[in-house]
């Protein structure tokens, strides 16, 4: 039985060409995260995480997207077009697999909060 | 320049162990996960596993688990694969290939090392 | 585990010809897939990664596409070089897992 909960930063803004954290939080399991797969609005992989081998990163972001925090994400020099749903999906053993959304909103405004669920360590 | 040198051909016995090895060179060792892949004669690939010298991470494709061990030697920039308990399924070519930074594909593979199980 | 599949085992081809060669994954992958081309008594050589990006040194005959389950691999003028076995091969989830393999033979 999946009893795991997935918690995200929720909906976030930024600035544009500023950066941005995009981070997931498996909580009330004791499954093993064997992976994270980063992943965007229209699926396509932005990274993932795999315990035992490390990163990868899609060649088409390796200058924007650096790994981590931890098993999160940060996007760097944003533009309006990155606007959008990102999607955590842990891979786990033995529950199986678990997603969870952000939704990031980029900003043109100078002033630009950056609200999340969770304090980010 | 990005090599891979395996060891050479073997002919083992039923029931018998072999370990091959990986000599790497053209790089720093630590930075690249080295996996091994078999194929079979005439056969397609089979991703047995990686190791992550960087932190000492394997991974094993489930049904190579109890078949292979994946280990290296740091100081001479060595990965080696143990192979037991063979049976003539075990008959095939092993190649030894390194991941490339910050992306999943092998980009550089060994010669291979033939393995053929026969009494 | 997915499943790669490369429905032709074989694909006749003359010099010069342009050539497809696909690759149905058994659920998505999203664009993490790479192509190997793999030469009589040789070791495999990467070409194409995720899906769409050629490894260093490989020439611009070579091209790949697709996205979530369906991906391509194009040779747009075969070159006598080029007989070999080309496989997908799949790293988005483990275990990591090839297909079958596609034979590429020259009238």
């Known amino acids: 039985m999946m009893t795991g909960t997935i918690e995200t930063t929720g909906n976030i803004s930024a600035k544009k060409g500023g950066s941005v954290i995009l981070q997931c939080h498996l909580s009330s399991t004791m499954a093993q995260v064997t992976q994270v797969n980063w992943e965007q609005h229209d699926h396509s992989l932005l990274a993932i995480r795999n315990a035992e081998l490390g990163w990868h990163i899609y060649p088409a972001f390796k200058d924007r997207v650096a790994p981590g925090p931890g098993l999160g994400l940060t996007l760097q020099s944003l533009t309006m077009n990155d606007t959008g749903e990102y999607f955590c999906t842990y891979h786990t053993y033995p529950d199986g697999t678990y997603r969870g959304r952000i939704f990031l909103e980029v900003l043109e405004s100078s002033v630009a909060e950056h609200s999340a669920r969770f304090q980010i360590p | 320049e990005v090599q891979l040198q395996q060891s050479g051909p073997e002919l083992v016995k039923p029931g018998a162990s072999v370990k091959i090895s990986c000599k790497t060179s053209g790089y720093t060792f630590t930075e690249h996960v080295i996996h091994w892949v078999k194929q079979s004669h005439g056969k397609s690939l089979e991703w047995i596993g990686g190791f992550n010298p960087n932190h000492d991470g394997t991974i094993y494709n489930q049904i190579f688990r109890g078949k292979a061990t994946l280990t290296v030697d740091k100081s001479s920039s060595t990965a080696y694969m143990e192979l037991r308990s063979l049976t003539s399924e075990d008959s095939a070519v092993y190649f030894c290939?390194?991941?490339?930074?910050?992306?999943?594909?092998?980009?550089?593979w060994g010669q291979g090392t033939s393995v053929t199980v026969s009494s | 585990d997915i499943v790669m599949t490369q429905s032709h085992k074989f694909m006749s081809t003359s010099i010069g010809d342009r050539v497809s060669i696909t690759c149905k994954a058994s659920?998505?992958?999203?664009?993490?897939v790479v192509w190997y081309q793999q030469k009589p008594g040789q070791s495999p050589k990467l070409l194409i990664y995720s899906p769409s990006y050629r490894f260093t040194g490989v020439p611009d005959r070579f091209t790949g596409s697709g996205s979530g389950t369906d991906f391509t691999f194009t040779i747009s003028s075969v070159q006598a070089e080029d007989l070999a076995v080309y496989y997908c091969q799949q790293h988005y989830s483990t275990p990591w897992t090839f297909g079958g393999g596609t034979k590429l033979e020259i009238k």
């Open positions: 659920q998505h992958v999203s664009n993490a």
């Open positions: 290939t390194r991941a490339a930074k910050l992306l999943f594909a092998m980009d550089y």
